[in-house]
């Protein structure tokens, strides 16, 4: 069971509806962006393999004070089987790189939206 | 209390491209998922796909190249374009609901009847 | 994709009667299977979800069981409005995908 409840969904939901509830969240932030997303915030850019989702909330999880992916950063940590908090990094990153917070939703919204029509939910 | 309607053209010639209208009453098309299922004669159901509140869209892989889901927010209705329609493609075509994070359809339209047949 | 076989894919019984239709997933589905009725000439209705929950002002003579691979509904003391096709849709993965049906009639 994916067991997203108390913060997003109502309770344990198939991987399925966890993933496709996180691209519509993903695309919501995408087509109601008006100003620069988080103030234009950088984070590290991440490699889109086994383990992103951990990998995408240790770099998200670094801004602060963005109201507009605070759901974001709830939903990925249920997909993510250990805690994270800021600072933590993983191999997953790409130490070197760092792309605005705009540029890492699009990034992982394409690459979800990719494994969604694959299959590939777990 | 939220009501799904579909409309067609009930009679198509092959090779034409199939045009469905779901009109939705009592419930704004802005929230939760719409989804098109067909019935096939001998009662087999086939998932089609979404299209979610936000329009994003969703459609069974072994649709793809076949199918297009839209939707016009102002009529709150959803549409199902199916080209290049077969005689395969006779069915009942239903519109459905689908709530966020749930994964079936807790209200389904009457259905419209489609046959294809030269 | 996820295959749901249905059986049987017809049954007769008499009123006052208990019926078990199965359905059985190709592969794990946890408790991710729902449950629909569709009488002669309606619209598909949810009857239970997540296996076992029973929707909204469905009548407690419905019930479901499984996990896995393997589900069944179960109808209690059969009543004239039962008759209809039933359907089993399973919710674990993209495509959707439904059992067969089963067309319940009365002797």
């Known amino acids: 069971l994916t067991c997203l409840g108390g913060f997003a969904s109502p309770g344990p939901v198939p991987p399925s509806t966890a993933l496709r509830e996180l691209i519509e969240e993903l695309v919501n932030i995408t087509q109601n962006q008006k100003a620069p997303l988080c103030n234009g915030s950088m984070v590290w850019s991440i490699n889109l393999t086994a383990g992103m989702y951990c990998a995408a909330l240790e770099s998200l999880i670094n801004v602060s004070g963005c109201s507009a992916i605070e759901k974001t950063q709830r939903m990925l940590s249920g997909f993510c089987p250990h805690k994270v908090s800021a600072g933590q990094f993983s191999s997953l990153h790409v130490r070197d790189t760092k792309i605005e917070v705009a540029q890492f939703v699009k990034d992982l919204l394409l690459h979800l939206k990719k494994l969604f029509r694959e299959g590939q939910f777990n | 209390e939220v009501q799904l309607q579909e409309s067609g053209p009930g009679l198509a010639k092959p090779s034409q491209t199939l045009s469905l209208t779901c009109s939705v009453t009592g419930y704004s098309i802005t929230s939760d998922y719409w989804n098109w299922i067909r019935k096939f004669p001998g009662n087999k159901l086939e998932y089609m796909g979404y299209?979610?509140?936000?329009?994003?869209?969703y459609y069974n892989p072994s649709l793809k190249s076949q199918i297009s889901i839209t939707r016009d927010t102002s009529k709150n209705q959803l549409y199902l374009q199916l080209k290049s329609a077969t005689t395969e493609d006779t069915a009942t075509y239903y519109c459905?609901?689908?709530?966020?994070?749930?994964?079936?359809?807790?209200?389904w339209g009457t259905g419209t009847t489609v046959t294809v047949s030269s | 994709d996820i295959q749901m076989n249905q059986s049987p894919s017809s049954l007769s019984a008499s009123l006052g009667d208990t019926i078990t239709i199965t359905c059985h997933a190709s592969q794990n589905i946890n408790v991710w299977l729902s449950w629909y009725q569709q009488k002669p000439g309606s619209l598909p209705k949810l009857l239970i979800y997540?296996?076992?929950d029973l929707h909204t002002g469905v009548p407690s003579r419905f019930s479901g069981s499984g996990s896995g691979t393997g589900f069944t509904l179960t109808i209690s003391s059969l009543q004239p409005e039962d008759i209809a096709t039933y359907y089993c849709?399973?919710?674990?993965?993209?495509?959707?995908?439904f059992g067969g049906g089963t067309k319940l009639e009365i002797k």
């Open positions: 459905a609901r689908l709530a966020k994070w749930t994964w079936y359809f807790d209200i």
């Open positions: 299209i979610s509140y936000n329009g994003n869209t």
């Open positions: 849709q399973q919710g674990q993965s993209y495509p959707y995908t």
């Open positions: 997540k296996a076992s």
